[in-house]
């Protein structure tokens, strides 16, 4: 069959399964004169043979683990054995079969983990190897915990990354492991090939002994610190300790205070650096952080609480330089004149701010001293001895001592004796008629002026008039402002009028005095007036119940999940149709009847959160007026981005030949959310075959070092595969390639002959 099994001499690649006895020829090469015979060279391993007539075949089963690719050359020779065509490369790719079982590198592993370690952070790796091809299921290993001993309440405290063999705590393990209760655990771990997905997979097991150690990285008890301390500062107030020596401690002030009066030393001791003032700030909450030598957080921050204890360092203060009260001539004994309310900045409801009131002087003392008394703790002034006469003494001045347990302050009170309130306010009109307004009349508009008069003493509480709407405006849409000089009342719109809920309102006003009426006098119909407010309809747009609607969902919610809803009402009672505007990513749809919002595509926090769209509510029918509100969808992160290289690393090179092993540093990142601590990647070589030449070592959570294991490298480009695991939930892994060139150098730069067109490395190591 020309083309598939026979043809002219040209470069070709053939794939053959290992382990199979030869059953057919590989290819029949055809000779063109002067070629008469063929010759085979290269990695034949005495398995591959070419007959003189060009028949290429193999004579026994292949083994991929011995050689995964046979690089052969075929040449066409003339009658004298001279090459007249070729040699051309013939590549035999040996396809893998699952003929090797996975094997753990150790039959027993030992490790330790601190209680309260972060869930998902690896503390131990088990490692198995399988000689089969890692690019096929045959060599893809799947790790599992078979059993955890002891198992308490059927809860797994440990988990394993089924791809990398990284063992870490579960959330429950992080919360519940306690060395005092159970200091050690044993895990039986299995590894299967075929990615764990086949009944025909091979497996192996190993035992893991885990010691639980105490975690001393704990938040200390809240601290109480007395304000205005006169002791020498700084003063140690508490301490934190990382589990191992060498941590670098720092404090984080989340409140961004202009003055942050705390510090921490490299032992983890926390100090207050200056006296505190409770009246400036009565409590502090800040965080202690432990970092490694590279400045990466070692764990979560600890919350430090400092409460500032009060001392009595503030005297009472008067409400104003002079407090003025009025009392009517005929007021009865015991009547309240008013209450003096002094203040104390010290802590409320403590002895430091508990105030006593005492009258220390009354002037004039006419007709006698002691006309007034003050309630010791409440500060309420009362008439103590007799009714007062304005014509005898129109004004009294009192000096009142206000004291807390340490300080005394004098406050001054002026009491004006005023005419008795025996006249009621009288409206000049009892009915102000009808007033017709459109419902969209502006707030603040004055819509009516009303007037009552009072014959009592002018400019006193007996004649001052206060207007109240006592009926017809339960929504509080209207208000009345009073001119203190003329007692004129101005009726104003305080809230929007609404034809739909109140087309006609029968409003009733009451006019009253701030001073009580004398005994026997009562407000009557003269103190009341009415008017009718008629509101006319204006077609209004629908109204949303909120200006901004907000919802929060995980970025990995299934398509079709309800992620939120909005509501609007039409003032005229028309039906509403909802729609979305600005859904630039095409993630959402809205039920036009209910306002429920659903996802219609995969969401992605990394594309931006919150995702902001506008929701439009439109009247159905009528004039189709619409209004717009915002919908903000906050996307909560899930670990859905594998790690990758933080930048382009093409152009790395070493000068050939290496005089000593070399190394280079690279950085990883991923697009998921890393809150306080930043990423915590782990690094390993991407395939076992690289381990003879390279090693990778973690520097910190984001950086690692790739080092050569020897100096015997060829002068060419090597592509080093690196496996980066983010330790998230679930853990994600990325395999990245670092191209490293070994090249002849001139003055520390890669030398390339003129005309060399490939990318020239630019970074020497």
């Amino acid at each position: 069959q020309e083309g598939k099994f026979s043809g002219p001499l040209k470069p070709m690649t053939f794939s053959i399964y290992e382990g199979q006895e030869p059953s057919q020829i590989i290819f029949q090469f055809k000779a063109n004169p002067p070629a008469v015979t063929f010759e085979l060279t290269g990695e034949t391993d005495n398995i591959f043979v070419i007959e003189r007539e060009g028949l290429l075949y193999y004579n026994r089963a292949l083994d991929r683990e011995t050689r995964s690719t046979h690089n052969l050359q075929v040449a066409a020779l003339d009658a004298n054995g001279i090459i007249v065509e070729g040699p051309v490369p013939i590549t035999i790719k040996v396809k893998d079969i699952n003929d090797n079982r996975p094997t753990f590198l150790q039959s027993k592993y030992e490790g330790s983990v601190r209680q309260n370690s972060r869930p998902g952070k690896p503390f131990l790796y088990v490692n198995a190897t399988d000689l089969d091809d890692p690019a096929t299921p045959n060599g893809q290993l799947y790790y599992q915990i078979v059993i955890q001993l002891p198992m308490i309440n059927n809860v797994m405290y440990f988990q394993i990354n089924n791809k990398t063999g990284a063992i870490s705590l579960t959330r429950e393990g992080s919360q519940e492991l306690n060395p005092a209760k159970n200091p050690s655990y044993n895990l039986v771990i299995s590894v299967k090939d075929m990615g764990g997905q086949s009944e025909n997979s091979f497996s192996d097991t190993t035992s893991v002994d885990i010691i639980v150690t105490e975690n001393i990285w704990k938040a200390p008890k809240p601290v109480e610190m007395v304000e205005n301390s006169t002791d020498p500062h700084p003063i140690k107030i508490t301490q934190v300790r990382w589990n191992d020596p060498g941590a670098q401690y720092s404090l984080v002030d989340k409140e961004k205070l202009p003055r942050f009066p705390f510090s921490i030393d490299q032992e983890g001791d926390i100090y207050v650096t200056q006296p505190l003032d409770r009246e400036e700030k009565d409590a502090y909450v800040f965080y202690a952080v432990a970092k490694d030598e590279y400045g990466k957080p070692l764990s979560y921050p600890l919350e430090i609480h400092v409460k500032v204890k009060d001392i009595n360092d503030n005297p009472p203060t008067c409400p104003s330089p002079v407090t003025v009260f009025e009392v009517q001539e005929n007021e009865r004994l015991g009547n309240s004149i008013g209450t003096l309310t002094a203040h104390d900045r010290d802590e409320e409801n403590t002895a430091n701010s508990f105030l006593n009131y005492r009258i220390v002087e009354q002037t004039p003392k006419l007709p006698m001293d002691g006309l007034f008394l003050i309630q010791t703790y409440a500060g309420m002034l009362q008439l103590a001895k007799q009714s007062l006469k304005k014509q005898d003494t129109p004004q009294y001045n009192l000096t009142i001592e206000v004291s807390d347990k340490d300080f005394k302050t004098l406050c001054f009170v002026q009491i004006n004796v005023i005419d008795i309130n025996d006249q009621i306010p009288i409206f000049e009109k009892s009915d102000y008629g009808n007033l017709t307004l459109a419902e969209d009349t502006n707030i603040g508009s004055t819509i009516l002026t009303i007037q009552a008069t009072d014959a009592d003493e002018p400019f006193t509480g007996s004649s001052k008039i206060l207007y109240h709407i006592i009926k017809g405006d339960s929504e509080g849409r209207l208000g009345v402002d009073t001119d203190p000089h003329t007692n004129t009342g101005y009726v104003i719109i305080k809230k929007p009028l609404d034809f739909e809920t109140a087309a006609v309102s029968n409003i009733v006003f009451k006019a009253e005095n701030p001073e009580p009426l004398v005994f026997g006098v009562k407000y009557n119909a003269s103190s009341f007036a009415k008017f009718t407010l008629i509101v006319t309809d204006v077609n209004e747009a629908p109204q949303f119940s909120q200006h901004v609607f907000q919802a929060k969902v995980s970025e990995d919610v299934a398509i079709g999940t309800k992620v939120g809803n909005v509501t609007a009402k039409d003032p005229e009672g028309l039906d509403i149709s909802y729609s979305l505007r600005g859904d630039t990513r095409g993630w959402l749809k809205i039920d036009h009847v209910t306002g429920e919002i659903f996802s219609v595509a995969p969401l992605d926090r990394e594309a931006g959160s919150p995702y902001r769209v506008q929701v439009v509510a439109t009247e159905v029918g009528g004039s189709s007026l619409s209004s717009v509100s915002e919908f903000h969808l906050i996307l909560m992160d899930v670990n859905d981005n594998p790690p990758r290289l933080a930048k382009d690393y093409t152009g790395l090179f070493f000068c050939h030949p290496l005089s000593a092993p070399g190394s280079l540093i690279f950085e990883a990142t991923d697009d998921d959310q890393h809150l306080f601590r930043g990423p915590h990647f782990t690094f390993s070589l991407g395939s076992g075959s690289l381990q003879n030449d390279w090693e990778v070592s973690k520097i910190n959570g984001t950086h690692a070092r790739l080092s050569t294991r020897h100096t015997e490298f060829e002068e060419r480009e090597y592509v080093v595969l690196i496996r980066i695991n983010d330790g998230g939930r679930p853990p994600l892994e990325g395999i990245v390639s670092l191209p490293v060139t070994f090249c002849s150098c001139v003055e520390g730069s890669c030398f390339r002959p003129a005309g060399h067109q490939t990318g020239i490395p630019t970074v020497g190591m």
Partner: antibody, heavy 119, light 112 residues
Framework: QVQLQQSEAELVKPGASVKLSCKAS????????IHWMKQRPEQGLEWIGY????????KVNEKFKGKATLTADTSSSTAYMQLNSLTSEDSAVYFC????????????WGQGTSVTVSS | DIVMTQAAPSVPVTPGESVSISCRSS???????????LYWFLQRPGQSPQLLIY???NLASGVPDRFSGSGSGTAFTLRISRVEAEDVGVYYC?????????FGGGTKLEIK
């Protein structure tokens, strides 16, 4: 047994042509190439070219192009070399030899034909 | 063209002694298949050349094992141990790696 029998000595005038023969026996003539060599008196050997009788493919050394023409007759198992425009420089002994097509060994040689160019 | 050089036009030898004849090529005669494409011939007086060694070190059929060939890609040696009177003649090396095939100038073995 394998034999290569070359034609008798030739005395030719300058400018003339001569055709030398090499008759093979004792093996399959078409399986192996026949090579021709020149040896001048008291001098070394020079390779003129070869012919492969199976497909009549001939290759001649650039130095002898226009001078030597190689042919073969499979029916008589004979290889021929014609030399043209002879000069005194062409006076030499000419050998034919067989090259095996498996080990590529020049294992059997003819006894040689002497060509003398003289007026 | 590949130039083959035999530096010694003649070598005298006493019968029963050993002798080495050398040859150099202007290009390596080693091919990727591992073979080195060099012949050694002996041309006795008044006879056709006779093949002694093929592919640098392989003894041709019927040739006494007193003869042996060795060398690298460009430098070659023919060694005759215990020289006999019948070994007299001119020894040629020849390359057949590529066209045109080329011969060395020859080395004459003479009995002292």
């Amino acid at each position: 047994q394998v034999q290569l029998q070359q034609s008798e000595a030739e005395l030719v005038k300058p400018g003339a042509s001569v055709k030398l023969s090499c008759k093979a026996s004792g093996y399959t003539f078409t399986d192996h190439a026949i090579h021709w060599m020149k040896q001048r008196p008291e001098q070394g050997l020079e390779w003129i070219g070869y012919i492969y009788p199976r497909d009549d493919f001939a290759k001649v050394n650039e130095k002898f192009k226009g001078k030597a023409t190689l042919t073969a007759d499979t029916s008589s198992s004979t290889a021929y070399m014609q030399l043209n425009s002879l000069t005194s420089e062409d006076s030499a002994v000419y050998f034919c030899a067989r090259m095996t097509n498996y080990l590529y060994i020049m294992d059997y040689w003819g006894q040689g034909t002497s060509v003398t160019v003289s007026s | 063209d590949i130039v083959m050089t035999q530096a010694a036009p003649s070598v005298p030898v006493t019968p029963g002694e050993s002798v080495s004849i050398s040859c150099r090529s202007s290009k390596s005669l080693l091919r990727s298949n591992g073979n080195t494409y060099l012949y050694w011939f002996l041309q006795r007086p008044g006879q056709s050349p006779q093949l002694l060694i093929y592919r640098m070190s392989n003894l041709a059929s019927g040739v006494p094992d007193r003869f042996s060939g060795s060398g690298s890609g460009t430098a070659f040696t023919l060694r005759i141990s215990r020289v006999e009177a019948e070994d007299v003649g001119v020894y040629y090396c020849m390359q057949h790696l590529e066209y045109p095939f080329t011969f060395g100038g020859g080395t004459k073995l003479e009995i002292k």
